[in-house]
């Protein structure tokens, strides 16, 4: 059956979010510098559950800490300045979850490194894209 235009739009937004998150992950993994060790000391909150678009609230709440860690890196590997990258992500997240959402994010007990955090949200996006296909 043909995919509805609203579903296609959601898929494209998720693809864009995925692209930005993978860019950050790639930039970190390519970062051959002692600062990587320091970046990995920063802890991020992980969602207890992330299976629906409303759960992107949990990602939104961690964008500021993410920007701070990326600023620390001062790397050209990110293709865009951290502020612009995070701004892009914020716009997409708001569009996907809806700005009227009153969802209260529940976080897991254990925190994660930036790499684990990014992997979690990339997996989330890919999973939703797959279910929409």
């Amino acid at each position: 059956a043909p995919t509805s235009s609203s579903t296609k739009k959601t898929q494209l937004q998720l693809e864009h979010l995925l692209l930005d998150l993978q860019m950050i992950l790639n930039g970190i993994n390519n970062y051959k510098n002692p600062k990587l060790t320091r970046m990995l000391t920063f802890k991020f909150y992980m969602p207890k559950k992330a299976t629906e678009l409303k759960h992107l609230q949990c990602l939104e709440e961690e964008l500021k800490p993410l920007e701070e860690v990326l600023n620390l890196a001062q790397s050209k590997n990110f293709h865009l300045r951290p502020r612009d990258l995070i701004s892009n992500i914020n716009v997409i997240v708001l569009e996907l979850k809806g700005s009227e959402t009153t969802f209260m994010c529940e976080y897991a007990d254990e925190t994660a490194t930036i790499v684990e955090f990014l992997n979690r949200w990339i997996t989330f996006c890919q999973s939703i894209i797959s279910t929409l296909t």
């Epitope: 693809e15 995925l18 692209l19 993978q22 860019m23 992950l25 790639n26 993994n29 992997n119 990339i122 997996t123 890919q126 296909t133």
Partner: nanobody
């Protein structure tokens, strides 16, 4: 290491056409998702078109009906046919290829400039 190289950009008049190509220096598995995004000065980066490993395509509303994305896995090349070009399509166009499973490798090119002006 895989590298992506875009070509086909240039100066074109409004209403004109261009075909961008994205060639890869190494093997990009047919299962990878590939796409094109563009960056205009002072504007948010825009994802223009995407093609999945299975050939499913998706387009930004701003280019729907005018742009067509395609890929030739045997040549490790992806294309973006751009018709009815407008001034607002002026930007640097980047191609990318990404893994859809961990470790989520992402590759992108250096970009090709498309200028639409009379």
């Amino acid at each position: 290491e895989v590298q992506l190289l875009e070509s086909g950009g240039g100066l074109v008049q409004p209403g004109g056409s261009l075909r961008l190509s994205c060639a890869t220096s190494g093997t990009i598995f047919s299962g990878y998702t590939m796409g094109w995004y563009r960056q205009a000065p002072g504007k948010q980066r825009e994802l223009v078109a995407v093609i999945s490993g299975g050939g499913d395509t998706n387009y930004a509303d701003s280019v729907k009906g005018r742009f067509t994305i395609s890929r030739d896995n045997s040549k490790n090349t992806m294309y973006l046919q751009m018709n009815s070009l407008r001034a607002e399509d002026t930007a640097v166009y980047y191609c990318y290829s990404r893994e859809v499973t961990p470790p989520w490798k992402l590759y992108w090119g250096q970009g090709t400039l498309v200028t639409v002006s009379s």
